[in-house]
């Protein structure tokens, strides 16, 4: 440790390079200063990344990892710092890029949309199920008519090229479908998807973009919805979703219209059945969505509602005289 | 019935150079992503690579990266391991094995008998 | 050291209930992933017992079932027969790792 008259004089770190180790994914490595005297203090290095979107993090080890879009170049900067109790002390500032690739930005895809969903699969020999992808974009205005885009997504260690392609009128690619990913329905990394492109006139920008699973996944509608009257009761109950969370994790929201009188109830709750107490002159129609509670995972999108229930009596009861 | 059937183990010097091969029959081979996990004598079992069905992509476990290969070739019913540098701590059993998942998690559910690969001088 | 954490050795009598524990972290097991487990009789490949948590492939024996909770998983065996000796290992799905998939470190059931 220092003593407190001690001087020292912080060096920032060397060799600072950033390398791409995957689709939207850096390295960021850099060793300590040589010169660097007091070597058996705490040192610590603080991460700066500058572009294309500002953070900054402190590590006590000499590279970090970095999940990152790159089609707008990469830029990071790391130095050397010193912490007690009372200040901090900072060597300059040792600083790297990547520039943005080749093409003019007009010239990449815009639009990317993409969404997960969960669905059986068919060549299991066990009952298990399968995370399919879907991406959409829209082609480069810029883009000569010959370009030819290919989309690629990364999640975790795994990277794929799409191999099932939708085409524009000029037999360019813009929609790519993957029956099965290697996705994790349950998990919390980014998914990485870059598309890139060719052209013979011109160089074509790639477009990279991270999603979170939470945000572009389809949840499935609930299964087995049934619906049945008993004198004012109307009983409704279902199933969860095919989803790789379990029975807890579900938010519903049931939506009841009376065909009579153009009234609609929709109630959400965290149960999987529901009673509503109606009059028994109407016909109904009944539909249950499912969305994933915020106890599982962040709040995302609601399933498509199930398909029509109907119940109730079809001819108009004359009311009761009494 | 689904069959795995490993080959292509030995005795190889450190420093060296093996294949392993896997032929696959009882099932369409080219819908599944294929493994190798590994099990040293009286130790437990240690996944080493994975490919993808189409055999674009591959998975390497950090014990193995840069000195291992997995490959396939779908016509034949194949799958690959071509082993290189190999060190004493290679030396294992080597399972073929199916890499199946549920929801993106993986699981293997067939294997191969084994074959042995022994590292030493 | 594996990543996930198994007893090196359980034993019982037959007609026993035994249960195998595989502790896990926040990054495998405790963000959800689901656990597999394998049995390895004595000279043989391993064979998948329990896929997603609970579930048996066809063949196996309704004496096998899992849980889990939390980090952790198990392994129940109930009714233990003889041909039950073997090892165990649990398997799942670590983010924190590069090619993710993960063993523990198995457990030697021995029948009395």
């Known amino acids: 440790d220092l003593l407190p008259d001690e001087k020292i004089s912080l060096l920032p770190p060397v060799n600072f390079t950033i390398k791409v180790t995957g689709l939207a994914q850096v390295l960021l490595q850099w060793k300590p200063n040589p010169d660097q005297e007091q070597r058996n203090v705490n040192l610590e290095y603080q991460v700066k990344i500058n572009a294309p979107k500002e953070d900054d993090y402190e590590t006590r080890i000499t590279e970090s990892k970095c999940v990152t879009i790159l089609h707008k170049g990469f830029s990071a900067s790391v130095r050397t710092i010193l912490q007690n109790d009372h200040s901090l002390l900072a060597s300059s500032w040792a600083s790297a890029e990547l520039h943005a690739p080749p093409g003019s930005p007009g010239t990449s895809i815009v639009n990317l949309t993409c969404t997960t969903n969960t669905t059986e699969d068919n060549y299991s020999r066990l009952r298990s199920y399968q995370v399919s992808l879907h991406c959409t974009w829209l082609v480069g205005t810029d883009a000569p008519e010959d370009t030819q885009y290919f989309l690629y997504y990364r999640y975790g260690s795994w990277t794929e090229e799409c191999q099932e392609y939708s085409k524009d009128t000029l037999g360019r690619n813009i929609a790519c479908w993957f029956p099965r990913t290697f996705i994790l329905s349950k998990g919390r990394d980014w998914l990485a998807v870059l598309v890139n492109g060719s052209s013979k006139h011109s160089a074509i920008r790639p477009f990279d973009q991270l999603f979170a699973l939470h945000a572009i996944d389809q949840i499935n509608p609930p299964l087995n919805v049934t619906a049945e009257i008993e004198g004012t009761r109307l009983s409704i109950q279902w199933e969860k979703p095919v989803s790789a969370f379990p029975i807890h994790c579900f938010d519903y929201e049931v939506k009841i219209h009376n065909t009579r009188n153009g009234y609609l109830q929709i109630e959400k709750l965290m149960t999987n059945a529901f009673i509503s107490i109606i009059d028994d002159l109407s016909k109904y129609d009944v539909q249950v969505r499912a969305a994933v509670s915020s106890m599982c995972r962040e709040a995302g999108l609601w399933s498509e509602w199930s398909q029509p229930i109907y119940v109730g009596n079809d001819e108009h009861k004359p009311l009761r005289e009494w | 019935q689904v069959q795995l059937q490993e080959s292509g183990g030995g005795l190889v010097q450190p420093g060296g150079s093996l294949r392993l091969s896997c032929a696959a029959s009882?099932?369409?081979?080219?819908?599944?992503?294929m493994s190798w996990v590994r099990q040293a004598p009286g130790k437990g079992l240690e996944w080493v690579s994975a490919i993808n069905s189409g055999g674009k992509s591959t998975n390497y476990a950090d014990s193995v990266k840069g000195r291992f290969t997995i490959s396939r070739d779908n016509a034949k019913n194949t799958l690959y391991l071509q082993m290189n540098s190999l060190r004493a701590e290679d030396t294992a059993v080597y399972y073929c094995?199916?890499?199946?998942?549920?929801?993106?998690?993986?699981?293997?559910?067939?294997w191969g008998q084994g074959t042995m690969v022994t590292v030493s001088s | 050291q594996s990543v996930l954490t198994q007893p090196p050795s359980v034993s019982a009598a037959p007609g026993q209930r035994v249960t195998i524990s595989c502790s896990g972290s926040r990054s495998n097991i405790g963000s959800g992933y689901d656990v597999h487990w394998y049995q390895q009789l004595p000279g043989t490949a391993p064979k998948l017992l329990i896929y997603d948590d609970n579930n048996r492939p066809s063949g196996v024996p309704d004496r096998f079932s899992g849980s889990k909770s939390g980090t952790s998983a198990s392994l129940a065996i109930t009714g233990l027969q003889a041909e039950d000796e073997a090892d165990y290992y649990c398997?799942?799905?670590?983010?924190?790792?590069?090619?993710?998939?993960?063993f523990g470190g198995g457990t030697k059931l021995t029948v009395l």
């Open positions: 094995a199916d890499y199946a998942t549920n929801y993106g998690v993986p699981y293997f559910g067939s």
């Open positions: 398997q799942s799905y670590d983010s924190s790792l590069s090619g993710h998939v993960v």
């Open positions: 009882g099932f369409t081979f080219s819908n599944y992503a």
